[in-house]
Amino acid sequence: HTAAQDNCTCPTNKMTVCSPDGPGGRCQCRALGSGMAVDCSTLTSKCLLLKARMSAPKNARTLVRPSEHALVDNDGLYDPDCDPEGRFKARQCNQTSVCWCVNSVGVRRTDKGDLSLRCDELVRTHHILIDLRHRPTAGAFNHSDLDAELRRLFRERYRLHPKFVAAVHYEQPTIQIELRQNTSQKAAGDVDIGDAAYYFERDIKGESLFQGRGGLDLRVRGEPLQVERTLIYYLDEIPPKFSMKRLTA
């Protein structure tokens, strides 16, 4: 696995322990919590990052209205089960044998049940809507400048292929970033939109996952873009299955 050979660190994930115990004595970095070797040339999967975090010693409307099937991560942090590739296992259970099904970004998509609950497949989240509210500025940002800067950020910092940034909407003070990536579109080596969104979310909160890099300094034409609220909506390829009781609550 690629890692900085000179001092054996992981540029893309500071929640790792790196040592020269890879093949041929090369630097190998293991994610905290799981101990799985990670590829430091790209983003680490959200599942392994969550596991590491849990182990760490925390008018013309241009804005998109989230679909009725959009999920918001209301359950917060949990210690997930990851598969050998570092993806979320479809079924997650806690220490008290309460289980639920999750999507590819680890967000619950069913009611909670017991150990008999079946989650046949990991349902892919193919559309992510990142809803941001920026702090007041002297004037509105230029939409095309804002669009270009956010696309550049996802391309350069998170290594997400530009084709997966579907749109950037702006209606001061709200910014919406749409990420879309179907199963058929995602090629080997492509960064997953769920992982990119998670890195972005942590950056926005001032909790960068990158090793040694400064925090996120977002500027549009030199003007700081400071985010004061973030909401992320997740849309799955198959709609979630919640009981009517939850839907009417």
């Epitope: 040592s19 020269p20 115990d21 890879g22 041929g24 905290l32 799985m36 050998p84």
Partner: antibody, heavy 117, light 107 residues
Framework: EVQLVQSGAEVKKPGASVKVSCKAS????????INWVRQAPGQGLEWMGN????????NYNQKFKDRVTMTRDTSTSTVYMELSSLRSEDTAVYYC??????????WGQGTLVTVSS | EIVLTQSPATLSLSPGERATLSCRAS??????ISWYQQKPGQAPRLLIE???ESISGIPARFSGSGSGTDFTLTISSLEPEDFAVYYC?????????FGGGTKVEIK
């Protein structure tokens, strides 16, 4: 030459604690994980946990999580494994091992811990 | 945790014969497997790492193969000193785990 030298045999009473040391030499102590593995009489090998001496990051097998503590002293290139609330089933040979490039390449001679009333 | 299952538990063979030991993982672990030999009263000795990479100083008659979930340790021609217990161990993820062992005994 890489060497891991462990402390001598111990006899303990149930409920007591034991602290086994493992002194490393012949390599850069802070660069490689030290693992602890135990083997009960006539049984197989059981991984207890490990410590990365460079930053003292520890990772414990859930089975021992509440009873084991691994520490290190970089000035003496020594790692310690303390096991508390001992019971008779903890009677075993405890090995420290340096994890290098894939496998546990270097092993201490083992420390027999006997728990008996 | 990843469970490693070794088979057979005991292998009775004569010197000069070929020994084939199996280790099966409960999930895909790539090539993150090592093999050890242990004799009574001694610490284990590393034979193979990364499923098939030989260790300096280990006789060439010891070889390893496999990836994913199925792994094999082969001793091409048993020498008298090879009769011992053999363990596989995974280093794919924590907790690291060992197989239950295969005892190779003289027939």
């Amino acid at each position: 030459e890489v060497q891991l030298v462990q402390s001598g045999a111990e006899v303990k009473k149930p409920g007591a604690s034991v602290k086994v040391s493992c002194k490393a030499s012949g390599y850069t102590f802070t660069s490689y994980w030290i693992n602890w593995v135990r083997q009960a009489p006539g049984q197989g090998l059981e991984w207890m946990g490990n410590i990365y001496p460079s930053n003292s990051y520890t990772n414990y097998n859930q089975k021992f999580k509440d009873r084991v503590t691994m520490t290190r002293d970089t000035s003496t290139s020594t790692v310690y494994m303390e096991l508390s609330s001992l019971r008779s089933e903890d009677t075993a040979v405890y090995y420290c091992s340096s994890y290098r490039s894939g496998g546990f390449a270097y092993w201490g001679q083992g420390t027999l811990v006997t728990v008996s009333s | 945790e990843i469970v490693l299952t070794q088979s057979p538990a005991t292998l009775s063979l004569s010197p000069g014969e070929r020994a084939t030991l199996s280790c099966r993982a409960s999930q895909n672990i790539g090539t993150s497997i090592s093999w050890y030999q242990q004799k009574p009263g001694q610490a284990p000795r590393l034979l193979i790492e990364f499923a098939s990479e030989s260790i300096s100083g280990i006789p060439a008659r010891f070889s390893g193969s496999g990836s994913g979930t199925d792994f094999t340790l082969t001793i091409s021609s048993l020498e008298p000193e090879d009769f011992a217990v053999y363990y596989c161990q995974q280093s794919n993820s924590w907790p690291f785990t060992f197989g239950g062992g295969t005892k190779v005994e003289i027939k």
